[in-house]
Every structure is written in C-alpha cells, then in structure tokens.
Amino acid sequence: HTAAQDNCTCPTNKMTVCSPDGPGGRCQCRALGSGMAVDCSTLTSKCLLLKARMSAPKNARTLVRPSEHALVDNDGLYDPDCDPEGRFKARQCNQTSVCWCVNSVGVRRTDKGDLSLRCDELVRTHHILIDLRHRPTAGAFNHSDLDAELRRLFRERYRLHPKFVAAVHYEQPTIQIELRQNTSQKAAGDVDIGDAAYYFERDIKGESLFQGRGGLDLRVRGEPLQVERTLIYYLDEIPPKFSMKRLTA
C-alpha cells in the first residue's frame, strides 16, 4: 500500500502488523486477529478492528429523540466473524454455540438463539446518532462553530464525505451528531458511517486507532471540547426483531 510505503506502517490502523512481504516486496499491512490485508489509505472496517482488539496481546427541542427502533450496543466487546470483505457476518456465534443476528455495525438486532438461528442478510445501519455530553465550560459553544468543527473532523480525520454528516445538534451540554448513509448513497471508496463512528468513539475514549498520531484534541475557537459521556444509537434499514419480553423489560 502506498500509504504504508515509506517506513512500512499503517497510518490509519495501529492494530496491524506491517511487513515488506507484499507483491514485489512492497509493504503490506495485515489486521491482527484476522490476518486480512488492509488499505492503509482509509479507515479499516469495524469488524476487523473488533477482531484485532480481541486478539491483541485487551419538548420543542432541537435534540433528536432516538426512534423506538434505535439500537444501543449493550453487549459490549465480542470476537466477531468477518466476511472476506471485512464486514460483519450477519450471524455471530460465541464459543458456547449461542448465536444472534447483527447489523452492519456489528450490534445485535435479534434475541439470542442457538446454531439453528438464521440471519438471511446483513441489515444495513443507515442512521447513526452520536449523543455526547461535554464537560462544563465557561459558556456554551457557538452552535455554528461547533457544527463546522465537527464536520471538519469527520471530513479530515475520518475521511467521511460531508454529505453523510446529516446534522449537528447542540443544547448545552448535549451535542448530537447525525450520520446518514443509505445503501444506494454509498459509492465504492466511500467510508462507511459505522466505521467513522467507531473511530470517533475510540478517539473520544482516548483510544485512538491511528498510528502514531496524538489523541483527539477537539477545540472550538480554541476552547477545548472535552467529552464526559458518549451514547451511540444505531438505526437499521429494517427494524430489529426482539421479543416482547425484551421490549417491556
């Protein structure tokens, strides 16, 4: 990969091992855990990153009310099965043969079952709502400055096309970033909103996935934007299928 050529490292993914063992002795970077060669000029898929992480030697408001069908990643970390494209396989199972269906960001969207569980297709997450609460500041941030800074961040750091950042809402101290990307909108080479959201989430937690770059230093007009809590909601093109028992719990 040309992005990794100079000193054989992967700028966009520190969870790789790079070696001059590609065609013609070129630098090639493989994701930990899966061994899949990754493109270091763009973001690595969330599935490969999760696999690498598991294998590594660790009222009239402007705010959006998440839809009743929105999913939150309550299950936490697991060692996923990725397809040859690096995407999540629709059906995931653990070591004890408990299986469940996931969406394109790897979040469970059905009740857990056994090996007979069928997941016919990988359902796309087309709308992601990132809900942030920032630490107290002297005053509120200017909404348009905040909007511009977050859009710049997603465009420059995560290489997400600006058209996929649908909106930035702000009601101190809550910031909401809406990412939208339908299957029909996503062209070859476009960063997936799920991958961008995952990189952002890890950045916010101080666990940057970028090689050698400093952590995320978010500033709005020179004022540090420090996030104290993050909640991410995922909305799928087809609503999830949970039993009533879970919905009423």
Partner: antibody, heavy 116, light 113 residues
C-alpha cells in the same frame, strides 16, 4: 540468499513433547511472518499457525490450539514449534515457511515420528 | 474457515500437452482494498518442500518457467501448464492466505500419460 534450516528428524513416544527449530538467514528475521505447516504421510498440507518475530504476535489454527506452541528467538533468528501430548496422529513432516505474497522460502522439513 | 477444493484429484497428460488444474474457494479471496487475490499455487515433489509457482492468483514467482500461468478471481482459479515437461510431474496445491486460518486445497497429482 534466504535460507530456512530446520532441525533433524525426531522419534518420540506417545504423551511426550517435541520442539522443532527453524533457523533463518539471509533476511531480516524480525520483519516477516514465519508460518508452520504440517504434512501427514501421504496427505496434504495444513497451516498450523504463524509468528511475527519482531513483535511476537502469534496466530494459531483453531485445530492446533492446545497442541502447538510457536515461539521465536530474535537473537538467533530462530523460530520454534513445540508439539505437546504427542499421539500417533502427530506423525508428520513439519515445515517452516516465510510467509507473504512472494515468499517462496521453506525449510527442508522435519519428520516427527510418534511410536511406542 | 475458507475451504479450498481442487479438481481433478489426479490428472494424466501427455508430454507437450496442456494441463489445467482448478481451485474453488468457499469465500472470495479478492481483497477489495487492494484488488489483490490472495491465492498461491505450489508444486511439491516427493521428499521436498512445496515450491511457490504463482502468487496473487496470476503473478509468476521469479525463476518459474513461463509455461506455468495462473488465472481467475474471487472464488474460481486455474493453474495452467501450457506444454507439460517430464519434470512437471508432482502434486500441485492451491492456498488461500486471505484470512486466518490459511488453507490449502487437497492437492492434484499430475502424471504423464
């Protein structure tokens, strides 16, 4: 030129362990993946796992987990593959190989015979 | 795991004739990031380690005679020997190194008719 030289044949009793070595020369040992491949008598090739000596990252084929341990000593540019709790089914030729798109470099193979 | 299936299991071809070995993988071996197929072909003679012939599905390893060629993409691959020579008698294996665990085909034994 690149060379991988493996240790000699071994005869072991069931239940014993064996450690096969693979000494690399002619290239920078720490920056290439090195894999181990098994070939039972008259059978095909099976990938057992690999190691990246520079950072000691190791991957195992699920089939061989608990049976094989792969290590490397960067000071001597030598990789090791240890088989534990040997059974007759472990009788095979074991190869080390430098991995990668254009890595046509294999050791000569080490025959491990398990017999009571 | 990716399953590699070769056909035929054995093949007898006359000297100077074309020999064709097929390899089918259970999942695509095409990496969308770099458009590279992670498939290699090896030749193994009795008592010897495998010898790399082709990598990236179609790139000939240096020193390999040009009668050997590889083709295919995704899940279907072919190794062709355009004019069989006596020294080509061996077992041929395809291998995926796309995703762990790397896997080999069961092998194709090539003989002279």
């Amino acid at each position: 030129q690149v060379q991988l030289v493996q240790s000699g044949p071994e005869v072991k009793k069931p239940g014993a362990s064996v450690k096969v070595s693979c000494k690399a020369s002619g290239y920078t040992f720490t920056i290439y993946w090195l894999g181990w491949v098994r070939q039972a008598p008259g059978q095909g090739l099976e990938w057992m796992g690999n190691i990246f000596p520079g950072s000691a990252y190791i991957n195992y084929n699920e089939k061989f987990k608990g049976k094989v341990t792969i290590t490397a000593d960067t000071s001597t540019s030598t990789a090791y593959m240890e088989l534990s709790s040997l059974r007759s089914e472990d009788t095979a030729v074991y190869f080390c190989a430098r991995e990668g798109s254009n890595s046509g470099y294999w050791g000569q193979g080490t025959l491990v015979t398990v017999s009571s | 795991d990716i399953v590699m299936t070769q056909s035929p299991d054995s093949l007898a071809v006359s000297l100077g004739e074309r020999a064709t070995i097929n390899c089918k993988s259970s999942q695509s071996l095409l990496n969308s990031g770099n458009q590279q197929n992670y498939l290699a072909w090896y030749q193994q003679k009795p008592g010897q380690p495998p010898k790399l012939l082709i990598y990236g599905a179609s790139t000939r390893e240096s020193g390999v005679p040009d009668r050997f060629s590889g083709s295919g993409s995704g899940t279907d691959f072919t190794l062709t020997i355009s004019s069989l020579q006596a020294e080509d008698v061996a077992v041929y294996y395809c291998q995926s190194d796309h995703i762990y665990p790397y896997t080999f085909g069961q092998g194709t034994k090539l003989e002279i008719k």
